[in-house]
């Protein structure tokens, strides 16, 4: 007959595993002794190996639950093509029987005592239940037996008292608007919400319990801009050293707007960041010397000659100046105290002259007195002799400029009855008053 052929036999459970297929003979399936077969689906699984006894099954339950009974177990001859020990064919069962005792004695029912008194009502107000109990001891059950029925019974009871209503909170109300519009000010901004003890309110008679917990909650506001912080001056810094070594100077103190620094649009510190003081060294300052104006040129002379006037003979002349006002170790005057030049003397020399053009108008004189006038002149100007403008006095020292010196006696044709100077005067018009400008400001 054809069988179902499997690739494995599971020793522990006696089951076929890994179905290869059906419609094959036992002989063909068992060409591989590791295989196993079933004659029908769900039937007994036989391995293809040579027959041997399976493990003993577990003991079956004891035939009775109390006092002495007996129990069975079995094993099976499994395999193909041969016999198990004792010349037993495959598929045969072998049994074992043993005595057993789950519980020595059998349970015996007990009997109830009479009912006890009713317990107080389960509540102190409105309606509840009350209970009474009885004991399973008349007689007591044996060997795990019990009494039939209930050990307690209950019935409704009415206290004839109205129950108090305990308070319960209603839901929280909305958060109030923030107590400030910015954070960092004198008061921390907070928002508040509250709830009422009204869901329900506690009863007055009989008195109910008030709501447990808190009715108000506060929390810090978030998302607010920082409050503006006005700037504050820090302390004045040290006075700077006097910047001068003599006379009066000016020292300075500085302070910084950082106590606190203005923040978040707060105003800058009012007032000045610096202040000055006069400092006095009590030391007079050095005064540098200054040259007076040059003195007059000395007469133009030539050594060893009595006079060179009105002659084409160069001479020499000098002028001096004085260094005045040097005090308290001030600098001496720079430069030469004496100036020397070469000259032609035309002192008192009669020279042909010519009238100059009109000079520009002079200043109005007197400037603050009555009837000021201005004047201009034409002068009889001498025509200087055509002497060489440079001379070489000492060989190797190069050419030196030569200057005409002295007051000649120019001769011009008479002009408007004058020989030397013709003057024209005019009054000054619309003359303003002389006033001290400082007094004018007052």
């Amino acid at each position: 007959d054809p069988v179902l052929c499997f690739t494995q036999y599971e020793e522990s459970s006696g089951k076929c595993k890994g179905l290869l297929g059906g419609g094959v003979s036992v002989e063909d399936c068992c060409l591989n002794t590791a295989f196993a077969y079933q004659k029908r689906s769900g039937g007994l699984c036989q391995p293809c190996r040579s027959p041997r006894w399976s493990l003993w099954s577990t003991w079956a339950p004891c035939s009775v639950t109390c006092s002495e009974g007996s129990q069975l177990r079995y094993r099976r001859c499994v395999g193909w093509n041969g016999q198990c020990s004792g010349k037993v064919a495959p598929g045969t069962l072998e049994w074992q029987l043993q005595a057993c005792e789950d519980q020595q004695c059998c349970p015996e029912m007990g009997g109830w005592s009479g009912w006890g008194p009713w317990e107080p009502c389960s509540v102190t107000c409105s309606k509840g239940t009350r209970t009474r109990r009885r004991a399973c001891n008349h007689p007591a059950p044996k060997c795990g037996g019990h009494c039939p029925g209930q050990a307690q019974e209950s019935e409704a009871c009415d206290t004839q008292q109205v129950c108090p209503t305990h308070g319960a909170w209603a839901t929280w109300g909305p958060w109030t608007p923030c107590s400030a519009s910015c954070h960092g000010g004198p008061h921390e901004p907070k928002e508040t919400r509250s709830r009422k003890c009204s869901a329900p309110e506690p009863s007055q008679k009989p008195p109910g319990k008030p709501c447990p917990g808190l009715a108000y909650e506060q929390r810090r506001c978030t998302g607010l801009p920082p409050c503006p912080v006005a700037g504050g001056w820090g302390p004045w810094g040290p006075v700077s050293p006097c910047p001068v070594t003599c006379g009066l100077g000016q020292t300075m103190e500085q302070r910084t707007c950082n106590h606190p620094v203005p923040q978040h649009g707060g105003p800058f510190c009012a007032g000045d960041a610096t202040r000055t003081h006069i400092c006095n060294t009590a030391v007079p300052c050095p005064v540098d010397g200054e040259w007076d104006s040059w003195g007059e040129w000395s007469p133009c002379i030539r050594r060893n000659m009595k006079s060179i006037s009105c002659q084409e003979i160069p001479g020499q002349q000098s002028r001096g100046r004085t260094c005045r006002g040097r005090k308290f170790d001030g600098h001496r005057c720079a430069g030469q105290q004496q100036d020397i030049r070469h000259c032609y003397s035309i002192q008192h020399c009669p020279l042909k002259g010519s009238w100059s053009e009109w000079s520009t108008w002079g200043l109005c004189m007197p400037p603050c007195g009555p009837n000021p006038t201005r004047a201009r002149q034409r002068l009889c100007t001498p025509l200087l002799p055509k002497y060489p403008p440079t001379v070489s006095m000492v060989e190797g020292q190069g050419e030196k400029n030569v200057t005409f010196w002295g007051r000649p006696l120019p001769r011009c044709e008479e002009l408007q009855g004058q020989k030397l100077v013709v003057e024209e005067k005019r009054p000054c018009l619309h003359v303003p008053a002389c006033k001290d400008p400082e007094e004018e400001e007052l």
């Epitope: 808190l214 929390r219 810090r220």
Partner: nanobody, 122 residues
């Protein structure tokens, strides 16, 4: 184990002010929400206020709102109850207590102080 000690109680005139302190030792008060309770003679212990761990949230009972303020100074390891405009009915033993989580309900607190007496004379 946090040990809480209340101080600052005493006798005060009605309308006056008092500041109670709750100082922690053996732990950091900044790790806990702190509640203030009071118990008047013959009455149940009442929760009157609570402050959260970071001080961002506070809760108050109806009876003290606007008069009492709770604040905390974690550097000093102390929580304060500032009592202003006190009334004779504020007479009680005041307790502070600490728990891990902030709640404005009546919930169990893990650590309790021994209490400080406040008496308001009429």
């Amino acid at each position: 184990q946090v040990h809480l000690v209340e101080s600052g109680g005493g006798l005060v005139q009605a309308g006056g002010s008092l500041r109670l302190s709750c100082t922690a030792s053996g732990g950091t008060v900044g790790d806990y929400a702190v509640g203030w309770f009071r118990q008047a003679p013959g009455k149940e212990r009442e929760l009157i206020g609570v402050v959260s761990r970071l001080g961002a949230r506070t809760g108050y009972a109806d009876s003290v709102l606007g008069r009492f303020t709770i604040s905390r100074d974690d550097v000093k390891n102390t929580v304060f109850l500032q009592m202003d405009s006190v009334k004779p009915e504020d007479t009680a033993v005041y307790y502070c207590a600490a728990r891990r989580d902030y709640s404005f309900e009546v919930v169990p607190y893990d650590y309790w102080g021994q209490g400080t007496q406040v008496t308001v004379s009429g």
